[in-house]
């Protein structure tokens, strides 16, 4: 026999959680003339949804409640002089990681 | 020392994967006359992204490559015909689960 209350709890716990997303380092850092290798990194960002929000809500959103910066070592290639060859260097890039997420109300109703 | 090729592989493997999403059973089954308990269930659906697509793509999307139907036991409450009150019954609802996902090209470029 399925415990139906357990299913509800499962939805609450696992529907809006930190998940793997790939981010383009160039776009994230707004460093447009620089090529990074790898071009993308895996970060934890809040994902999923809040389809059955416990709050009395018009719109329930999955948002980060705890954010940290993590450093990733990558290869950076950028033009330095002239028209051939890119200057290579290893660098640490800081990217936001979401550690905890919450379903929050965007526009609550009176009911 | 960080293996930069490993980071690229990590992005490829984990950025677009089956993830937990909550779905409203009523909306999923288009059964507006019925109340379900729980109202939402946890399903696996493709999520994440394909920010650094390996294909030469204008738009790379994370889509399911293997889909299965799974049955979930829920409590169903429907209006009784002709009389007041709700008819309660345990029922199995079939929901789509994504088992495998792929980054696919929506609009490839020649370059």
């Amino acid at each position: 026999v399925v415990d139906l209350n357990l299913l509800t709890e499962e939805v609450r716990l696992y529907s809006c959680t930190p998940r793997n997303f790939s981010v383009s380092i160039r776009e994230e850092l707004k460093r447009t003339d620089t090529i990074f290798w790898p071009g993308c990194l895996l970060v934890k960002r809040c994902g999923g949804n809040c389809a059955c929000c416990l709050h009395n809500c018009n719109e329930c959103q999955c948002v980060p409640s705890k954010v940290t910066k993590k450093y990733h070592e990558v290869l950076q290639l950028r033009p330095k002089t002239g028209v051939r060859g890119l200057h290579k260097s290893l660098t640490d890039v800081a990217l936001e990681h979401h550690e905890e997420c919450d379903c929050v109300c965007r526009g609550s109703t009176g009911g | 020392v960080v293996d930069l090729n490993l980071l690229t592989e990590e992005v490829r493997l984990y950025s677009c994967t089956p993830r937990n999403f909550s779905v409203s059973i009523r909306e999923e089954l288009k059964r507006t006359d019925t109340i379900f308990w729980p109202g939402c269930l946890l399903v696996k659906r493709c999520g994440g992204n394909c920010a650094c697509c390996l294909h030469n793509c204008n738009e790379c999307q994370c889509v399911p490559s293997k889909v299965t139907k799974k049955y979930h036991e829920v409590l169903q409450l429907r209006p009784k015909t002709g009389v007041r009150g709700l008819h309660k019954s345990l029922t199995d609802v079939a929901l789509e689960h994504h088992e495998e996902c792929d980054c696919v090209c929506r609009g490839s470029t020649g370059g």
């Epitope: 003339d33 002239g82 028209v83 051939r84 060859g85 | -």
Partner: antibody
Amino acid sequence: EVQLVESGGDLVKPGGSLKLSCAASGFTFSNYGMSWVRQTPDKRLEWVATIGSGGSYTYYPDSVKGRFTISRDSAKNTLYLQMSSLKSEDTAMYYCARQAPLWDYSDYWGQGTTLTVSS
Amino acid sequence: DVLMTQTPLSLPVSLGDQASISCRSNQSIVHSNGDTYLEWYLQKPGQSPKLLIYKVSNRFSGVPDRFSGSGSGTDFTLKISRVEAEDLGVYYCFQGSHVPPTFGGGTKLEIK
């Protein structure tokens, strides 16, 4: 298919100004450095300008520095060359070319647009 | 500036023959990163230049294997093993290792 189409070439008087355009298609324009190269009437090739994928890096040889400005609009997938204080020796066919991803070579060139500087 | 000198100015060949074009620089064209940015381009009549060889000896995609590049330091060569009609045109060498980047004066490959 990668395509580069130059336009804007014209007959201009010495000291005048002109802006050339290069419309890019078939690739993600914002990921690539771009260049202008010119070919004089005696068929000699000369590098004119280069710009980084995001537009903040630019390179000019001394022959055009201070007179020419290379720019790009990634929303329009277009490369530009603004030329001022034009001289007769600027008369040439102007080609736009795409820099390879790691700037190892220039892989695709447009068909060119002609600038004539003469009084 | 790095001066790139191409020889010969004109190269008459018969179809099927081997052709060899020389390009010499007046100084070493090794980039500060250790690479040598020496390229060969072919310009056919009425067309824009097309890349054949980059970094001395690497064939660009789609370029037939009858084209080969070699050399180092200041002395470089483009060889065409068996000349075909479609190979006719003007060949330019180019160095991008030093600023300003410079082209050779061109070698015209024509039918004997």
